[in-house]
Interface confidence: medium
Amino acid sequence: ASVATELRCQCLQTLQGIHPKNIQSVNVKSPGPHCAQTEVIATLKNGRKACLNPASPIVKKIIEKMLNSDKSN
């Protein structure tokens, strides 16, 4: 059984990093009864989804940049 069938997590695996120019938006899901881990789900400009590693320094920078751009808009 995969991780997805054990808990209601959406991220089975994570990408270590992705170029920010390919990302349209980022959603950070906090742990809860549905999933014990923090999940970072990026919506790419091509409409697809990708899970990012929340512990990755690159991903942290991407999240920070996205949140800052949201605040300034």
Epitope: T5, Q10, C11, L12, L15, K29, G32, I41, K49, A50
Partner: antibody, heavy 125, light 107 residues
């Protein structure tokens, strides 16, 4: 053909018990989460409970917590809902639903993409 | 728990019309939202998954949009078989919750 077939519904007195079954066919049952959803007469849909593919994780609506137990037997491709201490407000058609996830690279989601025909449960004295 | 509120609760329209049903979540759910269609005496049927993706076999006149808290289901050029009740459902977190439904009736 992917199919879900519920059974076990019927008339029961308040405080009584009932066990619903849902027989699955046409897909690898053990790989997918399953849910029970109910619909009271003339009302909308209410999620009742869900269970992970292995049966190791279970989830319940507050309205049934402590009274209902969801389980599955992957060797029999069957989902169960044990309903105890039944109340009049539990009267509904009960549906089982497969939570068929779609997998993109590094991403999974859950949607109730296959449903059974429903089994009616009436709680009345 | 996340509350889902649909509007309108009922809607009258004619064949060929374009109709829009809205669903609002009590907190942000990203795009973790599905739309279902249910006809009387039948089980629900998945129409749209993850807010905007058409389920296999569903006619292209159905479309979904939205993210965060506000979502819409649009049916272009209503067909006789589209008169039914429509529900939104969030899966962002448990407990899973449905909207109260929108009944689409023939005018």
């Amino acid at each position: 053909e992917v199919q879900l077939l519920e059974s076990g519904g019927g008339l029961v007195q308040p405080g009584g018990s009932l066990r619903l079954s849902c027989a699955a066919s046409g897909f690898t049952f053990s790989e997918l989460s399953m849910s029970w959803v109910r619909q009271a007469p003339g009302k909308g849909l209410e999620w009742v409970s869900a269970i992970s593919g292995s049966g190791g994780s279970t989830y319940y609506a507050d309205s049934v917590k402590g009274r209902f137990t969801i389980s599955r037997d992957n060797s029999k491709n069957t989902l169960y809902l044990q309903m105890n201490s039944l109340r009049a407000e539990d009267t509904a058609v009960y549906y089982c639903a497969r939570e068929g996830g779609r997998l993109e690279p590094y991403y999974y989601y859950y949607a109730m993409d296959v449903w059974g025909q429903g089994t009616p449960v009436t709680v009345s004295s | 728990d996340i509350q889902m509120t649909q509007s309108p609760s009922s809607l009258s329209a004619s064949v060929g019309d374009r109709v829009t049903i809205t669903c609002r979540a009590s907190q942000s759910i990203s795009d973790n939202l599905h739309w279902y269609q249910q006809k009387p005496g039948k089980a629900p049927k998945l129409l749209i998954y993850d807010a905007s993706n058409l389920e296999s076999g569903v006619p292209s006149r159905f479309s979904g949009s939205g993210s965060g808290t506000d979502f819409t289901l649009t049916i272009n050029s209503l067909q006789p078989e589209d008169f039914a009740t429509y529900y939104c459902q969030q899966y962002y977190s448990t407990p899973l919750t449905f909207g109260q439904g929108t009944k689409l009736e023939i005018k």
